[in-house]
Interface confidence: medium
C-alpha cells in the first residue's frame, strides 16, 4: 500500500525547491526498481517528485490566498515490467498560511450622523475589516480595532469595531469629526499587520441654544402721523442652532402703554415692531417697551436650555408733525 503523511507547504517560500514530504509504496525496498510519477494540476510546474525516492518538492512560491490546496495523483511503476505496483492514488497538498495580508476595510468610505449632545455610550457606527489570511490558522486573521484619531470624543470596541461616543459634543463648536480606526491582526502581537480607515462623523443639530437678541437696546422712531399697523422697525435675535431649531417667535414682554405689538417674520426670523395705537407727540413723545424672543419648537427634554427667554429694550421716539 501507499505510505504518506499529510502534506503541507508554507505559502510565500522563497527557496527554489522546498521539500514537502515523501510518497512511497511499502513494497519499495529501496533498490531503485520503482518509478514514481506525479499527475494532476500543478504536477511538473508547481510540484515535482523524485522518480526514484518519491520525495515531493514545491518549485514555485505559493499563495494560500490564491489557492489553498492542490489535489494530485500519484503512480508507482515497476521499472522492469512497466506495470503499476500500486493503484493510482489521489492525495492533497495543503498550503499553510503565513501572516502576509493586512486587514482591509471593504465598506469605505464610512460616514455616520449622530445628534449633538448624545450621551456617552451612544452607538455611532460599526466598522468591519476583513483579513484574507486563514482565520483557522493561529491569530493571522484575528483582528483588534483601535482608535488612532478621535479621542476623547469617540471610542471603539476592540473586538467588534463598534464606535461609540465617549464624550458629549456640541455641534455649535464643531459639527463634524474625522475618526481614524486601525485594525490589527495577530491580536496585536509582534509581527502584526494593520490597516486603517477614516470615518466622517457628522453631528446633527438639537435645540440646545435659545435665541439671543443681537442688541440689548434698540432705538426706533415713529411719526405721530403714522397709522395703526405701521411697521416702525425690526429687531433681531440670533440662534446658534440651525433649521427649525433656529425658528423663533418675538413678543412684547412689557408695554405699559399697550401702543405697540411685535410680529415675527418667519422667513427672515426678524421681529417687526408694529404700531397698535396712534401716538401723539404732545401727549407722549417717547416710549420704552421690552420684547422677548423664544424658539418655536422646543422638545420637553431640551427645555433646560431655554429657561430664561432673552429680552431687549426698545426705545421709541415719537417724531413731531406740524399740525394745521
Amino acid at each position: 500500500g501507499w505510505v504518506w503523511n499529510q502534506f503541507f507547504v508554507p505559502e510565500e517560500m522563497n527557496t527554489t525547491s522546498h521539500h514537502i514530504g515523501q510518497l512511497r509504496s511499502d513494497l519499495d525496498n529501496g533498490n531503485n526498481s520503482f518509478q514514481y510519477k506525479l499527475l494532476g494540476a500543478g504536477a511538473g510546474s508547481t510540484f515535482i517528485i523524485d522518480e526514484r525516492t518519491g520525495d515531493i518538492y514545491a518549485i514555485q512560491k505559493l499563495d494560500r490566498e490564491e489557492r489553498s490546496l492542490y489535489i494530485l495523483r500519484a503512480q508507482v511503476i515497476d521499472i522492469a515490467t512497466g506495470r503499476a505496483v500500486e493503484p493510482e492514488s489521489e492525495f492533497v497538498i495543503k498550503v499553510s498560511d503565513i501572516n502576509d495580508n493586512e486587514p482591509k476595510f471593504l465598506d469605505e468610505p464610512y460616514e455616520a450622523i449622530v445628534p449633538e449632545m448624545s450621551p456617552e455610550g451612544t452607538l455611532v457606527i460599526q466598522v468591519t475589516a476583513s483579513d484574507a489570511d486563514d482565520p483557522s490558522s493561529g491569530n493571522n486573521a484575528r483582528l483588534l480595532y483601535s482608535l488612532l484619531q478621535g479621542q476623547p470624543y469617540f471610542s471603539v470596541e476592540p473586538t467588534t469595531g463598534v464606535i461609540r461616543i465617549s464624550s458629549k459634543m456640541d455641534r455649535e463648536l464643531q459639527d463634524e469629526y474625522w475618526v481614524i480606526i486601525q485594525a490589527k491582526d495577530m491580536i496585536g502581537q509582534p509581527g502584526a499587520l494593520s490597516g486603517t480607515t477614516s470615518v466622517l462623523i457628522k453631528l446633527s443639530d438639537v435645540n440646545d441654544n435659545k435665541p439671543i437678541f443681537k442688541e440689548s437696546l434698540y432705538r426706533l422712531t415713529v411719526s405721530e402721523s403714522a397709522p395703526t399697523g405701521t411697521s416702525i422697525g425690526t429687531i433681531m435675535a440670533y440662534d446658534n442652532d440651525i433649521g427649525e431649531n433656529a425658528e423663533m417667535d418675538y413678543s412684547i414682554e412689557e408695554d405699559d402703554s399697550q401702543t405697540f405689538d411685535i410680529i415675527t417674520n418667519h422667513e427672515t426670523q426678524e421681529g417687526i415692531v408694529i404700531l397698535k395705537k396712534k401716538v401723539d407727540f404732545e401727549h407722549q413723545n417717547h416710549y420704552g417697551i421690552r420684547a422677548k424672543v423664544k424658539n418655536h419648537h422646543v422638545p420637553e427634554q431640551l427645555m433646560k436650555y431655554h429657561t430664561e427667554a432673552s429680552t431687549t429694550f426698545i426705545k421709541i421716539q415719537v417724531e413731531d408733525v406740524d399740525e394745521p
Epitope: R219, F313, Q317
Partner: antibody, heavy 119, light 107 residues
Amino acid sequence: QVQLVESGGGVVQPGGSLRLSCAASGFSFSSYDMDWVRQAPGKGLEWVAVIWYEGSNKYYAESVRGRFTISRDNSKNTLFLQMNSLRVEDTAVYYCARETGEGWYFDLWGQGTLVTVSS
Amino acid sequence: EIVLTQSPGTLSLSPGERATLSCRASQSVSSSYLAWYQQKPGQAPRLLIYGASSRATGIPDRFSGSGSGTDFTLTISSLEPEDFAVYYCQQYGSSWTFGQGTKVEIK
C-alpha cells in the same frame, strides 16, 4: 473711572455764542444716548437736549430749539453743545448726563459748567 | 408738557426720622417713566430711583419709591446725616421734566 467732565462755560453777552464740551471716560461712550440738563442759579433742573448714541437723532427742549445744537464725536468720546443767540435766561450750570440703556433717566452726571449770560 | 409738582417745598426733620416726599403729575405718567434724584450743594444730581420703585445701583435700601398714575412718593425710612439734600422727581414719558424739588433739612 467712569466719569463725565464738562468744560467751556464762561461769561458771554446776550446774543453771543459758546460751545460746551463733555469728555467721557471709563465706559463705552458710543453705546449711550447723551443729554444736556441745566440748572439756573437756585432753581430746579431743566432738560435741554438729547443725542442718540450714533448721532442720528437729536431732540431739543422748546426753550432752546433753533438756537442750540447738540453733537458728539464718538472717536474722541466727547459730547458738545453749541449755544448761539444766548439769552439772559440761559444762565445756568450745564450738566451733561448719560441716559441708561433701558430708559430716559440719567444714571451718570458731570460736575457741571457755569454759563453766565450778562450784559 | 407734563408738569410735576413736589411737596412740601421744604421738609425739616431730624436724623433717624422718616421722610415722605410727594410728586404729583399734571397728567398720568406710566410708572415705568418716573425717577427720583438727590442733589447736594455744589454737586451734580445722583440717581436714586427709576421706574417709580426700582433702586439704582449702590442706593441704600432706606430709600424706596412708590406710586402710579399721577401720585408718586419717595420715602426715606430713617434719615442719615448724609441724606439732607434736595430731591427731584423726573418724568421721562413725554419729553423730560423735573419737579421743582423738595429740600430736606436738619431740624
